[in-house]
Interface confidence: medium
Amino acid sequence: FERTRSLQDPCSNCPAGTFCDNNRNQICSPCPPNSFSSAGGQRTCDICRQCKGVFRTRKECSSTSNAECDCTPGFHCLGAGCSMCEQDCKQGQELTKKGCKDCCFGTFNDQKRGICRPWTNCSLDGKSVLVNGTKERDVVCGPSPADLSPGASSVTPPAPAREPGHSPQ
């Protein structure tokens, strides 16, 4: 199939980084500055994405690949290919229409993005609460009394009231 296609369509010989220029008898011409073609056989090159404003350049555009953006400090990416930047909040907060708000009691957020999530209900899993939750951290579930076989460690290290950093999901 590929061989047949190349006999019928000379453009299929044009590699990535070029385009098939109809104005020049279908000669493969390099993509102009600030444009790219990531696949062969293209009849046009695509304009490079420009990372402006709250976006910053993570990867420069080349003749064969588009630029990639991320967000300036204080913001994080949302959407495929970082199509949007959303404001960071502090751990223990979530972003609402009115800005960053503290997590309600019984919920936590251990990241600078996303929503406050309910503390885990340890009892649903037959466990007990080993360490209480905070706005920034989920509870830590411990074994149920039945799980503590003789000789098993039941020493609980002290948990700081407010711990630095964040715990991941």
């Epitope: 503390w119 899993d125 509870v139 948990a159 950093g165 991941p168």
Partner: antibody
Framework: QVQLQQPGAELVRPGASVKLSCKAS????????INWVKQRPGQGLEWIGN????????NYNQKFKDKATLTVDKSSSTAYMQLSSPTSEDSAVYYC????????????WGQGTTLTVSS | DIQMTQSTSSLSASLGDRVTISCRAS??????LNWYQQKPDGTVKLLIY???RLHSGVPSRFSGSGSGTDYSLTISNLEQEDFATYFC?????????FGGGTKLEIK
């Protein structure tokens, strides 16, 4: 009992994307995070990212952000990890593992899928 | 990222011995430290979580201790099935990170 079932092996050509699966059983799928961990031959373990099946909320290790895409199918209690443009560097054992709550440990692991990237 | 260092990559011991495997974090991880065992066939199991809590079904010859940045796993009275590779992992900060592993071999 809790089980995370993974295919034993997958073979993929360089550049062709691959989707690894992890079928969960024996617990409420939507209540536990599914994580993916990479282990190269003779090497340590690397956390790739995780997904909360209830709402498909994901976290990624920055190192794998452009390589891995995590999804779930709640109807079949299966988690997936798609690897884009695989190279020989992606040849490894990939484990799925679960945990319940923030900071909790990985309490159950799949057997791992050995991915071979070769032409 | 928090770096987890297991300074001993392999360790030889005999049946009945008591061994201690250490793990150091590049910053305080407030006891959010877990230990796993990996058998030669690749099977991975949780042993200890939150520094010293024994996971259900794990024999009491396994114990964990530590605080701040320094943690350890102790296996007393080694049995044949304990010869495996042991990994520490921090659950404090994204991304979750593991130590490089300590392979426990029979002397």
């Amino acid at each position: 009992q809790v089980q995370l079932q993974q295919p034993g092996a997958e073979l993929v050509r360089p550049g062709a994307s691959v989707k690894l699966s992890c079928k969960a059983s024996g617990y409420i799928f939507t209540s536990y995070w599914i994580n993916w961990v990479k282990q190269r031959p003779g090497q340590g373990l690397e956390w790739i990212g995780n997904i909360y099946p209830s709402d498909s909320y994901t976290n990624y290790n920055q190192k794998f952000k452009d390589k891995a895409t995590l999804t779930v199918d709640k109807s079949s209690s299966t988690a997936y990890m798609q690897l884009s443009s695989p190279t020989s560097e992606d040849s490894a054992v990939y484990y799925c593992t679960r945990f319940h709550y923030g900071s909790s440990p990985f309490d159950n692991w799949g057997q791992g899928t050995t991915l071979t990237v070769s032409s | 990222d928090i770096q987890m260092t297991q300074s001993t990559s392999s360790l030889s011991a005999s049946l009945g011995d008591r061994v201690t495997i250490s793990c150091r974090a590049s910053q305080d991880i407030s006891h959010y430290l877990n230990w796993y065992q990996q058998k030669p066939d690749g099977t991975v199991k949780l042993l200890i979580y939150y520094t010293s809590r024994l996971h259900s079904g794990v024999p009491s010859r396994f114990s964990g201790s530590g605080s701040g940045t320094d943690y350890s796993l102790t296996i007393s009275n080694l049995e044949q099935e304990d010869f495996a590779t042991y990994f520490c992992q921090q659950g404090h900060t994204l991304p979750r990170t593991f130590g490089g592993g300590t392979k426990l071999e029979i002397k």
